[in-house]
């Protein structure tokens, strides 16, 4: 009683003329005429057409013929009601209607699940005119059905501002299971339980799931989709997949690797990016993370001097950006540097140790016993000092920098002089008379300029005054520098 076609249903034949019989509203089936060679027979329907309407939405024409007989109502003839076919197969189905020739413009549209099918669909409408009526066959074909073609299809015809709607043709596409959720790769803690999920749909339903671990089935009995596999724990890496079975066959999910979290590998390629007297900028390439994100890293620094006490300085930093500036180091010193990083499981081993050196430092002490006196005859200021006690890490003395500031009547002028490392005296020209000259001296190495000595002041009188005794920095423990006259 249900009119349906199976997937092997072939296209309807092209009828050589109009359908036999006049317009009908009963359920007498539409019989095909003998088919042309090369065509398969039309689908045949049971004579009673049960499950089909006797009444419905039909257009009742108001026009009458010459004999003034009212025309019968218009309705689509009944066609196949249910088509079951496999994915990727082709299908063709049609709607047919006989329309009195008094109607000129008739268009048939196809609709699926309430939406009009436009564009890239294969819809063909054929007209077979006769004396009084024109048989119209609207065919719809899909060359390779997809799951998305599943649905209820209807024809609509606009005529005389009326809409005539066919009964539906149910298209049921069946195929291999289609995954809607596949297991995903995970990184898990050793011997800790975890879940994997697999979900697949038909039609046909039901879809049953088998789990596979390292090519062996986990469950002997299938589980209904969706399926959650609880793995009690792993001690080594494993590959899981799921098989989805339905009446059409089997689909296998992608295989996913489940990794066991471990401590990271040690960093590699620790390198020196930049060195200063008291800091070293290092970078490193992180090792394998052990399937768990790095949390932070530890930089270990040892003095390379065999005479050192061997203590290790530890600097903690974030795992990114694989760069760290080690500070508070001694100048002109050698260090061994190693890097270790950690994840949630623990610390990696230390990277291979590398040697690094700080550069020379600037002097840490100012020149001592700075003395300043005026040589009025030559209009010069003579400056003398003692070489500072330089430490080894301060590097080699390359000279001195002398700052002399001249202040007179609200005017202040600073000048700098550079002096070679050999001497311990200098002479500067008087810049301004009737002014105070303030002198400071700093030692200079390749590592930079050291601290300046305490200022020594000397008053430079106007021309014709007597010589003055020198000014000097005080002996240690004395008060501020004084001007000695």
């Amino acid at each position: 009683a249900i009119t349906e076609a199976r997937e092997e249903a072939k296209p309807y034949p092209l009828f050589p003329g109009p359908f036999p019989g006049s317009l009908q509203t009963d359920h007498t089936p539409l019989l095909s005429l003998p088919h042309a060679s090369g065509y398969q027979p039309a689908l045949m329907f049971s004579p009673t057409q049960p499950g089909r309407p006797h009444t419905g939405n039909v257009a009742i024409p108001q026009v009458t013929s010459v004999e003034s007989k009212p025309l019968p109502p218009l309705a689509f003839k009944h066609t196949v009601g249910h088509i079951i076919l496999s994915e990727h197969k082709g299908v063709k189905f049609n709607c047919s209607i006989s329309v009195p020739n008094i109607y000129q413009d008739t268009t048939i549209s196809w609709w699926k699940d309430g939406k009009e099918l436009l564009g890239a669909h294969h819809a063909i409408t054929q007209f077979y005119p006769d004396d009084e009526v024109t048989a119209i066959i609207a065919s719809f074909s899909i060359t390779s059905v997809q799951r998305s073609d599943n649905g209820s299809y209807i024809c609509k015809m606009k005529i005389n501002n009326e809409e005539i709607v066919s009964d539906p043709i149910y298209i049921e596409v069946q195929g291999l299971p289609h995954f809607t959720k596949q297991p995903e790769s995970m990184n898990v803690t050793r011997n800790t339980a975890f879940n994997l999920t697999c979900q697949a749909v038909g039609p046909p339903e039901p879809v049953n799931i088998f789990w596979v671990q390292n090519s062996s089935r986990v469950n002997e009995q299938p589980e209904k989709s969706p399926s959650v596999l609880t793995v009690p724990g792993l001690t080594e890496m494993a590959v899981f997949s799921c098989e989805a079975h339905n009446d059409k066959g089997l689909t296998v999910s992608k295989g996913v690797q489940i990794n066991i979290k471990a401590i990271p590998s040690p960093p590699t390629e620790v390198s020196i990016r930049n060195s200063t007297a008291h800091s070293i900028l290092i970078s490193w390439v992180p090792g394998f993370d052990g399937y768990s994100p790095f949390r932070n890293c530890s930089i270990q620094v040892k003095e390379a001097d065999p005479l050192s006490n061997g203590s290790v300085m530890i600097f903690n930093t974030s795992a990114l950006p694989h760069l760290y500036q080690i500070k508070q180091l001694q100048a002109l010193a050698n260090y061994s540097i190693g890097v270790s990083c950690m994840n949630e499981i623990g610390w990696s081993a230390v990277s291979p140790w590398i040697l690094a050196s700080t550069t020379e430092g600037a002097p840490s002490v100012a020149p001592l016993n700075v003395t300043v006196f005026l040589n009025e005859s030559s209009d010069n200021v003579d400056i003398r000092w003692m070489k500072p006690p330089t430490k080894q890490q301060d590097g080699e003395l390359v000279g001195y920098r002398i700052s002399h500031v001249w202040q007179s009547a609200g005017i202040s002028k600073e000048l700098l002089e550079e002096v070679g490392q050999n001497g311990s005296r200098a002479r500067i020209s008087v810049q301004v008379h009737n002014a105070t000259c303030t002198v400071r001296i700093a030692a200079v190495t390749r590592g930079g300029v050291g601290p300046f000595s305490d200022p020594v002041k000397i008053f430079i009188p106007a021309h014709g005054w007597v010589d003055y005794a020198p000014s000097s920095t005080p002996a240690p423990g004395n008060a501020d520098p004084v001007l000695i006259i």
Epitope: A1, I2, E4, A5, R6, A9, L43, M44, F45, S46, T48, P50, G51, R52, P53, H54, T55, G56, N57, G81, H82, I84, W111, K112, D113, G114, K115, N150, G151, S152, I154, I164, V165, S166, D167, P168, Y170, I171, E172, P203
Partner: antibody, heavy 118, light 112 residues
Amino acid sequence: QDQLQQSGPELVKPGASVKISCKASGYSFTSYYIHWVKQRPGQGLEWVGWIFPGNGNTKYNERFKGKATLTADTSSSTAYMQLSSLTSEDSAVYYCARLGLIYALDYWGQGTSVTVSS
Amino acid sequence: DAVMTQTPLSLPVSLGDQASISCRSSQSLENSNGNTYLHWYLQKPGQSPQLLIYRVSNRFSGVLDRFSGSGSGTDFTLKISRVEAEDLGVYFCLQVTHVPFTFGSGTKLEIK
């Protein structure tokens, strides 16, 4: 989620009529047949008929011709069944159900109880 | 009309047992194109019927694999491999091959 929501219980007098409703949601109402099924208390199920909301076409079980009238309002996605000239024999729970693509009644309403009593 | 005879009317079972319900039609339910429109439903107390098996042997979406259907022509069987408490209710067969559509009289599955 495809759903059919039926109207509430009805208590009617003999000889009267009643119209019960079935509101569809979650799918294209005009594309699938709606069937109606009767179940008398403690008894089996009896098919009343169907309507195709897309064109209003109907088909009835001979036993319910003249008793049941099936209609549909596409603007509200609601199917109706009117029962007329009610007697105690019409007291039952009436279900609406959708004929799905698999050509089975796949989704059912929760049922509407009709009690005919004076 | 296609008369559907369902047996037994009542089926007492123990939890975990297998249950088997038969449905026989007065005429073949095979359609001219080879499909058989015989479906099985479960109606739990106070609920609407719910589809279990469609077209003889296809489990509907969400139905557990404990339920299986078989048969052809006029004789059909629903099997429940391991009965659980949630399976209790009345089971109906329905044919939609011939109009009017007809239901079986129902089988009440109950605990022994």
